[in-house]
Interface confidence: low
Amino acid sequence: KLTIESTPFNVAEGKEVLLLVHNLPQHLFGYSWYKGERVDGNRQIIGYVIGTQQATPGPAYSGREIIYPNASLLIQNIIQNDTGFYTLHVIKSDLVNEEATGQFRVYPELPKPSISSNNSKPVEDKDAVAFTCEPETQDATYLWWVNNQSLPVSPRLQLSNGNRTLTLFNVTRNDTASYKCETQNPVSARRSDSVILNVLYGPDAPTISPLNTSYRSGENLNLSCHAASNPPAQYSWFVNGTFQQSTQELFIPNITVNNSGSYTCQAHNSDTGLNRTTVTTITVYAEPPKPFITSNNSNPVEDEDAVALTCEPEIQNTTYLWWVNNQSLPVSPRLQLSNDNRTLTLLSVTRNDVGPYECGIQNELSVDHSDPVILNVLYGPDDPTISPSYTYYRPGVNLSLSCHAASNPPAQYSWLIDGNIQQHTQELFISNITEKNSGLYTCQANNSASGHSRTTVKTITVSAELPKPSISSNNSKPVEDKDAVAFTCEPEAQNTTYLWWVNGQSLPVSPRLQLSNGNRTLTLFNVTRNDARAYVCGIQNSVSANRSDPVTLDVLYGPDTPIISPPDSSYLSGANLNLSCHSASNPSPQYSWRINGIPQQHTQVLFIAKITPNNNGTYACFVSNLATGRNNSIVKSITVSASGTSPGLSA
């Protein structure tokens, strides 16, 4: 079928269009083009006779048309009037007519649009703005862009006038943006330059910075005011309602208590005509006095006296704070604070309560500390200690004993021998001693302030012969692989050599054995069951020697992994099952059995008579050593076969 295709269909003014013919019949006489949807001689554009190749213009010929041998028609320099239908009339050689109609549309090339506005300075929350895209153009589509994005959906945005007008109702400062309009038709699209909407707003409620409202006398006051506003706000300051200055910042140096009051910042927008104010209350505090501590007892006695520390001066409506050793007060039943925190009472003072103590007065801006106070706690004397610790001496040596007892004030010392006063010194010295110097040596310490006395007695033996030593232990039942044991050879004697034997042999070399304290102490680290031996210590000097009785170390160990005997696991039905469990352990462990997880008896031997296949299963022996706190277990599978079905063993 004969058809006409317009290329392009939408044509811009001044361009050209080709009316292309498809399915042109064979054996043609000629063809003719007409403007419109039908053949009308008055509207003929051009005719063409194939035989003569002669083109004949018609009444509608404009001089811009070119006809091609394939019947296609090119129209150049298109004008608006060219829009419409075009009909091709084909006359075949048999003079049978055929017609086809095509069409195209002509659109103008659009000019660059511009935006007009009905309000160049709208006021926020009050005005509406109508943007209109110019010029008005027929058959054009209008589009709008905000910050190069398509329009958001909003009840405050309205398009009208064929989308040519964009109205923003109740403008806000957020509408301050770049607006563009665009015109489109099928042959062109043009975008306008940006129009920036200048929304007048504010001033908002101003903010005063900094936020702090409390100052000390003598500081500088520097307040700054800011309010969101377009155009920028003009600022005024008022103090207690009295105008001060028209600046954004207010500066008052070296303030006093008299500068306390209400400070108002007023922001004014001359374009919107609006004023907004913000008030802040400034309080200026005078410097408080430095506090100090008084005490009701300057020399309290340990465990007897209480001490009340008071923070001075007394000031109404003030918070008092306390520190001990530069830390806040610990929680203690011996520390009591009065209702106003001004008095700190130490009940039944101890020597550890010396301090230092500080109190503080808190005001709105800071805390003022007192100087530290240290308590002079009277204590002691504690039980004196006599050194050195030797109790055996050889004749002919010098005896020099020293006594010390913790005490405040320092203790006064006295020495007694067999109850007889000797001297009032801290040290006792006797040269070239003999057996007659053996006896009870007493040191007496006296605290003159508290009136308390304490004594310690030491037995001194002067003898050429050494006594029989003995072994003391710090752990009588050590646990294997866990504990250490320290054996000490007693007594401590001057100019004496200490020796050790294990099972009658001298000490083996071992990283687990360590001698210390002049060989007087033997330490066994990480004891094992093999350390359960006889230990003997000996002492000797140039005159005599002696050995202790043996001490046997009782090492607690185990339980080790138990062994179930006999080892058999297959039995014939009807046999007796007699299982015995053993585990190395000190002390002996407690035994218990489980069959298929079910607890049985607490015995070392499990006996079941005349077993059947029902006795198949897992037999578990559990061992527990209460002394070491350790447990162990083993599981054995037992299979019982019906008689004659397997050559199993019989118990």
């Epitope: 589009l143 398509s150 958001p152 959906v153 009840p155 405050r156």
Partner: antibody
Framework: EVQLVESGGGLVQPGGSLRLSCAAS????????MHWVRQAPGKGLEWVGR????????KYADSVKGRFTISADTSKNTAYLQMNSLRAEDTAVYYC??????????????WGQGTTVTVSS | EIVLTQSPATLSLSPGERATLSCRAG??????????LHWYQQKPGQAPRLLIY???NRATGIPARFSGSGSGTDFTLTISSLEPEDFAVYYC?????????FGQGTKLEIK
């Protein structure tokens, strides 16, 4: 700061009624649409409906149309969801969310903590 | 009613990997060329949290590893490098026309 607090949830028998509240602060509900969204246990989110508090116009999901009514009290800055003829399938956590240019830029940027509605006999 | 289909239903990944979640609309959700499709994250016992609005805009306080793209009917949420706190359920929602609809959700779980 924008805040939404839903309340009024609880246990109700099938056929019963319940009224949920959504108290808003930090913005004016007149400037937005107020939506209700629900989430059944272990399921996804389902839009229930919305109201324009400025004029009272409301829209609903087909599943609740005729049974649920959304209203708003602009003086209290609060939206409500009146639920009648409740069914077991209405069991869910119910959320409210504002939607509009001023508050949430045309998405649900703010949600309440949700209130649980259980419909069971 | 515009139907939103999310895929996959479950996504198993490890921290540090890239996650790509898809949301397909039964018809275009564009208005003036802008996709009115949003992405939300929800963790157990919590309300949904807006991640991406109108296709590609990150909501306030959302880390830069979250991004959205797409227009018309096909939209994608991408998490460039997964953090432990990103494992949750993600929903898409269209607000182009009533009724506003949500996708059925994609569960992002730790592999």
């Amino acid at each position: 700061e924008v805040q939404l607090v839903e309340s009024g949830g609880g246990l109700v028998q099938p056929g019963g009624s319940l009224r949920l509240s959504c108290a808003a602060s930090g913005f004016n509900i007149k400037d937005t649409y107020m939506h209700w969204v629900r989430q059944a246990p272990g399921k996804g989110l389902e839009w229930v409906g919305r109201i324009d508090p400025a004029n009272g116009n409301s829209k609903y999901a087909d599943s609740v149309k005729g049974r649920f009514t959304i209203s708003a009290d602009t003086s209290k800055n609060t939206a409500y969801l009146q639920m009648n003829s409740l069914r077991a399938e209405d069991t869910a956590v119910y959320y409210c969310a504002p939607f509009g240019y001023y508050v949430s830029d045309y998405a649900m940027a703010y949600w309440g903590q949700g209130t649980t509605v259980t419909v069971s006999s | 009613e515009i139907v939103l289909t999310q895929s996959p239903a479950t996504l198993s990944l490890s921290p540090g990997e890239r996650a790509t979640l898809s949301c397909r609309a039964g018809e275009s959700v564009d208005i003036f060329g802008v996709g009115f499709l949003h992405w939300y994250q929800q963790k157990p016992g919590q309300a949904p949290r807006l991640l991406i609005y109108r296709g590609s805009n990150r909501a306030t306080g959302i880390p830069a590893r979250f991004s959205g793209s797409g227009s018309g009917t096909d939209f994608t949420l991408t998490i460039s490098s997964l953090e432990p706190e990103d494992f949750a359920v993600y929903y898409c929602q269209q607000t182009n026309e009533d009724p506003y609809t949500f996708g059925q959700g994609t569960k992002l779980e730790i592999k």
